[in-house]
Amino acid sequence: TQNKALPENIKYGIVLDAGSSHTSLYIYKWPAEKENDTGVVHQVEECRVKGPGISKYVQKVNEIGIYLTDCMERAREVIPRSQHQETPVYLGATAGMRLLRMESEELADRVLDVVERSLSNYPFDFQGARIITGQEEGAYGWITINYLLGKFSQKTRWFSIVPYETNNQETFGALDLGGASTQITFVPQNQTTESPDNALQFRLYGKDYNVYTHSFLCYGKDQALWQKLAKDIQVASNEILRDPCFHPGYKKVVNVSDLYKTPCTKRFEMTLPFQQFEIQGIGNYQQCHQSVLELFNTSYCPYSQCAFNGIFLPPLQGDFGAFSAFYFVMNFLNLTSEKVSQEKVTEMMKKFCSQPWEEIKTSYAGVKEKYLSEYCFSGTYILSLLLQGYHFTADSWEHIHFIGKIQGSDAGWTLGYMLNLTNMIPAEQPLSTPLSHSTYV
């Protein structure tokens, strides 16, 4: 009789990323007998939950169940029924919920409580919903990209998995941009740190890593825009804000009450002689860049070197993977190519921002104006954050790789989170087994 491979024992895991602007559900799978190997876990599905982030459900907690239904049902379809009960489900909430918790711990707890009750109704092994720290978000993002790039593997390969993978074991730094926070995580050259708050020590697959990480709350792209508007309206002479970060001809009325809803604008809050103001775009990259820089306080640094706002940042080291909104925005602007220099990116941003709003609407007709209008700001903000915030230069720009997926898995903190919670990243290098995993009968 013909030899047949026994059916592989496959395991699954689910992680929900409850971000500030939306929630995504990720389904991962891996061969059970290889779960301590590096690089065997991969994403089989991403389901984007329709609607805003869970923090917006603070007045609508009764709808959280409906909100999560479609993606949880999708998970039920994708994962074989026989595996449901042993499939762990984790929900991690990030900066949107950190901000809600700052406003009201009670309200944040209420949202998480309803989320937990909703997720407990499914046949999976629900492991809890929690607000992860900014440090965790940075660390797990770093673990994810290096796991997917094969940086933890001790086996040297003669081939590269992805175009920008060098065959050495030097880890990539991680740059993550969300709607409400941004994270920078990397292994600095100098192992000693001036700021213990920003230091993490890992032992992964038999190797020690001393990692620097920081999460800047309120410096995600959406909250940064609110900050900028709140800062600029302070000095406006009337209820018209001529804004260089929006295209010429763009007009939008903003309620002052909406501007001051977020804790991120508290430092700029003042009594204004109007309830509404109108943004009038003038589309000037250079002026927009200058306005954004005013969000970064670089006048104070109690360390040898800082990013901004007095936060320690060691000298940058090695290559970096820039993902989440870093990727989404730059991909929209068609600026993710490895061949595009920082000077060229700046030049293209100048051109993009100066394009009349009517022209932009025609060029990108399928995109809702609400989102389309913000790409000039977002692109400018990314450049400002990377260059002035994190001190990348025209030369070191070439070490930034804008990454959406690696080997079919999204770059982001969720995979690293699951690998950690399922104990799939051993501290020591697993002993290699003499026999192959396939068994034939």
Partner: antibody, heavy 124, light 112 residues
Framework: QVQLQQPGTELVMPGASVTLSCKAS????????MHWVKQRPGQGLEWIGE????????NYNQNFKGKATLTVDRSSSTAYMQLNSLTSEDSAVYYC?????????????????WGTGTTVTVSS | DIVMTQTAFSNPVTLGTSASISCRSS???????????LYWYLQKPGQSPQVLIY???NLASGVPDRFSCSGSGTDFTLRITRVEAEDVGFYYC?????????FGGGTKLEMK
């Protein structure tokens, strides 16, 4: 099932204002944009504007700027449209309609669920 | 604003035969991304409108495959094969390429 419930009729005096309601049920209210459409007797459809119930972001047809104001009450899953300085030209059926935009939240979609419509009659 | 033009009436149709309803836009609705931002809605007598077709070629959920749409960037035709009694009403084409979204004046489909 998904429903958008609107009152049947509103009789208002010329020059007055009226606020039309649209109560959503059977889905997550803040997950879908809401649109308002006008239909005058025996005539076609005219788009008034749209609102994102998650954050009150609005877009209006220029023809209705100053005439219509779109708002939502998230706690009751209700969308509202206030019409002011009413004249006989405003006598019409007004529909609210939900926008379905597929998996990409940033893309424009189509109006997949329509309300029952409110007939507004402006008369002294 | 983009103007959508429809003829007010179609030729009366016999049950079980085919019907065609045309629509013209004042500007091409075919975008460089390959999507045509043209939609069809049906308003049956005494009812609210309902979507039939989105982005020119996609059938909305629950709509029978008797309905189809073809066209260039500016000229569109809605075809109904094997017309049924429940298909009577006003057919509206619409665009959402640009704000404000605009509708055609509607075409009344009647039975012989």
């Amino acid at each position: 099932q998904v429903q958008l419930q609107q009152p049947g009729t509103e009789l208002v005096m010329p020059g007055a204002s009226v606020t039309l309601s649209c109560k959503a049920s059977g889905y997550s209210f803040i997950s879908y944009w809401m649109h308002w459409v006008k239909q005058r007797p025996g005539q076609g459809l005219e788009w008034i504007g749209e609102i994102d119930p998650s954050d009150d972001y609005t877009n209006y047809n220029q023809n209705f700027k100053g005439k219509a104001t779109l708002t939502v009450d998230r706690s009751s899953s209700t969308a509202y449209m206030q019409l002011n300085s009413l004249t006989s030209e405003d006598s019409a059926v007004y529909y609210c309609a939900r926008e379905e935009n597929g998996i990409y939240y940033y893309n424009k979609g189509y109006l997949d669920v329509w309300g029952t419509g409110t007939t507004v009659t402006v008369s002294s | 604003d983009i103007v959508m033009t429809q003829t007010a009436f179609s030729n009366p149709v016999t049950l079980g035969t085919s019907a065609s309803i045309s629509c013209r836009s004042s500007k091409s609705l075919l975008h460089s991304n390959g999507i045509t931002y043209l939609y069809w809605y049906l308003q049956k007598p005494g009812q609210s409108p309902q979507v039939l077709i989105y982005q020119m070629s996609n059938l909305a959920s629950g709509v029978p495959d008797r309905f189809s749409c073809s066209g260039s960037g500016t000229d569109f035709t809605l075809r109904i094969t094997r017309v049924e009694a429940e298909d009577v009403g006003f057919y509206y084409c619409a665009q959402n390429l640009e704000l404000p979204y605009t509708f055609g004046g509607g075409t009344k489909l009647e039975m012989k």
